[in-house]
Interface confidence: low
């Protein structure tokens, strides 16, 4: 704000990210043949006009005219924060103050607490922590594109007394759809200027198998070769497949991995077939009705858990 007093210098508050460069600009309308001076929060003179007063190579002269003194401070540290004073040695001495705020950059977050091989419907609890922010950063969670509601960010002062460590926890019940999902903790802070700073944890979920029977070809005829593929899914993937035909004993032999093969279809092959896929998480039986009299088999929609 330009005062009615033309010899009153003016400046502005500045915000800078730690490690960055800040320019301090001081202007005066009527210098009364006096030089402008910048001093730091410890009241050490930095520049008097174009003359360097403090041996600090980070501090450089940007502009020195009778009406302006601008200096730059590079590689700014948290300790540089405070009120910088621009003075003009008129009678009386007039001063203007610039509050330099140094933002501490939050470190990449760290996720802890993940327990491998969660079972479906169990609760996953993850913790996220980031140090070094000033002011205190905020943490957010997401699972893929879905936002997760973690607890309120907790704030703790770092040992340096200037920056903060923030932490947050999130808990959620896992489903089979979460197998292989990435849980992401992101740190939000004005020093990042919108840049993404996040850490992800891929989770594994163990769940019971499912299966479906797929005929090949899709529409077999009498006399053709037919394969009934039993396609099992689950985590872990089913390792054991057992075929049965309703009304027949004992279980049928597979001739190709999990598939049941009919080298030459005839009417006696008609009937309902079941495939039981088993993992150490459980079993699932899928059914398929084959009617060789018809031009094509008709799959049934029924399936049974065991």
């Amino acid at each position: 704000n330009l005062s009615q007093d033309d010899s009153q210098p003016w400046t502005s508050d500045e915000t800078v990210v730690a490690g960055g460069t800040v320019v301090l600009k001081c202007q005066v309308k009527d210098h009364e043949d006096s030089s402008l001076q910048w001093s730091n929060p410890a009241q050490q003179t930095l520049y008097f006009g174009e003359k360097r007063a403090l041996r600090d190579n980070r501090i450089q002269l940007v502009s020195s005219t009778p009406h302006e003194l601008s200096i730059s401070i590079s590689n700014v540290a948290l300790a540089d924060e405070g009120e910088y004073t621009c003075s003009i040695f008129t009678m009386p001495v007039r001063t203007a103050k610039s509050l330099v705020t140094v933002l501490g950059i939050p470190q990449k977050p760290i996720i802890t607490g993940y327990k491998s091989s969660l079972r479906e419907k169990e609760t996953a609890t993850l913790n996220c922590q980031s140090s070094g922010s000033k002011p205190a950063a905020q943490l957010t969670w997401r699972k893929g594109d879905q936002e997760l509601h973690g607890d309120q960010t907790r704030i703790q002062e770092d040992p340096n007394g200037k920056t903060f460590t923030v932490s947050s926890s999130v808990s959620f019940q896992v489903t089979r759809e979460d197998d292989g999902a990435n849980i992401v903790c992101s740190v939000n802070h004005e020093s990042l200027k919108g840049a993404d700073r996040s850490t992800s944890q891929r989770i594994e979920v163990l769940y019971t198998p499912t299966a479906m029977i797929r005929p090949e070809p899709a529409h077999p005829r009498e006399g053709q070769k037919l394969l009934l593929h039993c396609e099992g899914r689950g985590n872990p993937v089913p390792q054991q497949y057992v075929w049965v035909k309703e009304g027949s004993e004992p279980p049928l032999k597979m001739t190709q991995e999990s598939a049941l093969i009919f080298p030459f279809l005839n009417k006696s092959d008609s009937g309902t077939y079941g495939c039981t896929a088993t993992s150490n998480m459980g079993s699932y039986t899928a059914y398929f009705t084959l009617n060789v009299n018809d031009p094509s088999p008709v799959p049934s929609s029924s399936s049974t858990y065991h």
Partner: nanobody, 124 residues
């Protein structure tokens, strides 16, 4: 721009307690300091208490020390002043304020945004 809306004033007997609230909207509340000032009838505005953005640093006027507590809840964007052991000389219009810098300021000139004021009357 910051808007500050105050609540919680009223009439209280000497020795009683009151809690003032100040809800902020606009610019991110948590990044900036906040202060409480008061103005007694016929007097100038005087500093009561201030708190920095994290709540870790507070400062009190001598008249408020030991009786008043300033606090903030950044999740609710709200500043509080808990006033205990109230005296007749605490009667004043109380204002919450926000400066444009990220450090607490103890001088009214350092504040840019002000609440509407709330009257606290201490009388038997």
């Amino acid at each position: 721009q910051v808007q500050l809306v105050q609540s919680g004033g009223g009439l209280v007997q000497p020795g009683g307690s009151l809690r003032l609230s100040c809800a902020a909207s606009g610019r991110t509340f948590s990044n900036y300091a906040r202060g409480w000032f008061r103005q007694a009838p016929g007097k100038g505005r005087e500093f009561v208490a201030a708190i920095d953005y994290s709540g870790g640093s507070t400062n009190y006027a001598d008249s408020a020390k030991g009786r008043f507590t300033i606090s903030r809840d950044n999740s609710k964007n709200t500043l509080y002043l808990q006033m205990n052991s109230l005296r007749a000389e605490d009667t004043a219009v109380y204002y919450c304020a926000a400066p444009a810098s990220r450090r607490p300021s103890w001088d009214a000139d350092g504040y840019d945004y002000w609440g509407q004021g709330t009257l606290v009357t201490v009388s038997s």
